[in-house]
């Protein structure tokens, strides 16, 4: 085994009483911002649960991992991390749980090495379409981002703008085609009712897509065909009733895919026959033996893999004269 990195676990804290004196001068190259902990050995700065209202201006140039979680940032303006010289090595930025409700165009500009961004658990009522692309050009410079974590960013109902939340998020993902290199996208727990049909086709490099714990009812208009590199697709805890033939064929055609479908209210009627047949044959669904019917009542908790065609009937539609009120 090799020896530990120098001062491997040493996080130096800046002295709070120095903060006002330092802010009046140009920042020293490797000082630690007030209310933060820094480890040059680990190239890490942690400003966690400090109720910060803005991003510290005096971040050390060596930072590769920046944790700004549990603060009260409210707004990320354009160039929030732009510094001179730039934070050229900042690779992972975690802003989760920092009460952000607005991320403006160009908020992450001038971070040439930023590959992982976590904005989870922020009530993002206003996410600029150009938050990740930085400009409103039809084709922007490629973003270096490969992992974008946007779990639970849906604001409370009363704080939402008068527009589709799904549409706002997707606009930011697609603007300027800047995220063509994105490999991991997490959008769990966002109350999504639908997935705009064009979003996946324009993120061709995706390896991992997490849409769990949303309210997706159908995937009928969603195409997975272009996602030839997709390795995992998380659809647990949604409102899916059935997957139709087109979706089943597309998923089966993805060479490396693993699909997670637990805890959806599957409707086990005649429309489920194709999906049951597919489930019995496919290897792509993880934990497929756990999938159970939610409806109709007589089928509740039946295991999908144990159903046969005789179980999957649709009640005949009665002519109007025979329908009861």
């Amino acid at each position: 085994s090799s020896s530990p990195t120098s001062s491997a676990s040493s996080f130096s804290s800046s002295a709070p009483f120095l903060a006002s004196a330092v802010s009046a001068q140009p920042p020293l190259p490797d000082q630690c911002p007030a209310l933060c902990e820094c480890s040059e050995a680990a190239r890490t700065v942690k400003c966690v649960n400090r109720n910060l209202t803005e991003v510290p201006t005096d971040l050390p140039a060596y930072v590769r991992n920046l944790f700004l979680t549990g603060n009260q940032l409210a707004v990320l303006p354009a160039g929030a991390f732009a510094r001179r010289p730039p934070l050229a090595e900042l690779a992972a930025l975690n802003l989760s749980g920092s009460r952000l409700d607005e991320v403006r165009a160009g908020a992450f500009e001038h971070l040439p090495s930023l590959r992982q961004l976590d904005l989870s658990h922020n009530p993002l009522a206003d996410l600029s379409p150009f938050a990740f692309s930085g400009s409103n050009a039809s084709v922007s410079a490629p973003s270096p981002l490969v992992e974008l974590i946007l779990n639970h960013i849906v604001p409370p109902e009363d704080e939402r703008q008068n527009r589709s939340f799904e549409g706002m998020v997707v606009a930011a993902l697609l603007a300027g085609r800047a995220l063509q290199g994105l490999r991991r996208l997490e959008l769990a727990s966002n109350h999504f009712l639908y997935l705009p049909r064009d979003v996946l086709a324009q993120l061709p490099s995706l390896r991992h897509l997490d849409l769990s714990n949303n309210s997706l009812v159908s995937l009928t208009y969603v195409s997975f065909r272009n996602l030839t590199h997709l390795e995992s697709l998380h659809l647990e805890d949604n409102a899916l009733k059935v997957l139709h033939n087109g979706t089943l064929a597309e998923l089966q055609g993805l060479p490396h895919i693993r699909v997670f479908l637990d805890n959806n209210p599957w409707v086990c009627d005649c429309h489920m026959a194709d999906m049951v047949t597919w489930l019995k044959e496919t290897e792509v669904v993880q934990g497929k033996d756990r999938l159970t019917c939610a409806y109709p009542e007589k089928m509740r908790n039946r295991v999908l893999l144990e159903l046969n065609s005789a179980d999957l009937d649709c009640d005949p539609i009665l002519p109007p004269s025979l329908q009861t009120s």
Partner: antibody, heavy 121, light 107 residues
Framework: EVQLLESGGGLVQPGGSLRLSCAAS????????MSWVRQAPGKCLEWVSA????????YYADSVKGRFTISRDNSKNTLYLQMNSLRAEDTAVYYC??????????????WGQGTLVTVSS | DIQMTQSPSSLSASVGDRVTITCRAS??????LNWYQQKPGKAPKLLIY???SLQSGVPSRFSGSGSGTDFTLTISSLQPEDSATYYC?????????FGCGTKLEIK
């Protein structure tokens, strides 16, 4: 003192399966991304797979994607590599290594001694 | 994925010599490059991280430089115990990759 100890290697037939383990001690295991790296006899080092500290993110070399699965049990301080559909070209010494820093900013500062996997009929 | 090319693949030098090994990335990787030393039958050992930072406990005769696509590992005064294979590794990409090594022998 940080220690990584691999086990589970051995002789397996083509198409067979094997599960490697790496027992970690001397550090807070869940705080570190971990990786498997292999080296075929007389050949270069090949990065195989990695996993984040929480286990929520996994990464695979194209050569093993769909056949190998990396996982970890943070309660047992153990890293795993499940290897299925093994091929002759998977024959190698498999090293477990610790990433220092996050996956996207890291270097491997500690390595185990390796365990030999031989795939042959 | 990012390819790493090392040169030379092998070299022979005398004790006291200054030795330089180069590593080239197929695209810019900023300074996300590490160097490892491996001796026969042993696990690799970290020498240099972040292109130029010396790992604790590694002799100061080892140094690293470079940024972007071209990187160099230098041994300022070769010692007998430096006989080994040296590997570069990039951690900029979504998948991390090693160069194929430079085998250094002592004359």
């Amino acid at each position: 003192e940080v220690q990584l100890l691999e086990s589970g290697g051995g002789l397996v037939q083509p198409g067979g399966s094997l599960r490697l383990s790496c027992a970690a001690s001397g550090f807070t295991f869940s705080s570190y991304a971990m990786s498997w790296v292999r080296q075929a006899p007389g050949k270069c080092l090949e990065w195989v797979s990695a996993i984040s500290g929480s286990g929520g993110s996994t990464y695979y070399a194209d050569s093993v994607k769909g056949r190998f699965t990396i996982s970890r049990d943070n309660s047992k301080n153990t890293l795993y590599l499940q290897m299925n559909s093994l091929r002759a070209e998977d024959t190698a010494v498999y090293y477990c290594a610790r990433y220092y820093g996050g996956y996207y900013s890291a270097w491997m500062d500690y390595w185990g001694q390796g365990t030999l996997v031989t795939v042959s009929s | 994925d990012i390819q790493m090319t090392q040169s030379p693949s092998s070299l022979s030098a005398s004790v006291g010599d200054r030795v330089t090994i180069t590593c080239r990335a197929s695209q810019s990787i900023s300074s996300f490059l590490n160097w490892y030393q491996q001796k026969p039958g042993k696990a690799p050992k970290l020498l240099i991280y972040a292109a130029s930072s010396l790992q604790s406990g590694v002799p100061s005769r080892f140094s690293g430089s470079g940024s972007g696509t071209d990187f160099t590992l230098t041994i300022s005064s070769l010692q007998p115990e430096d006989s080994a294979t040296y590997y570069c590794q990039q951690t900029y990409g979504y998948l991390h990759t090693f160069g194929c090594g430079t085998k250094l022998e002592i004359k």
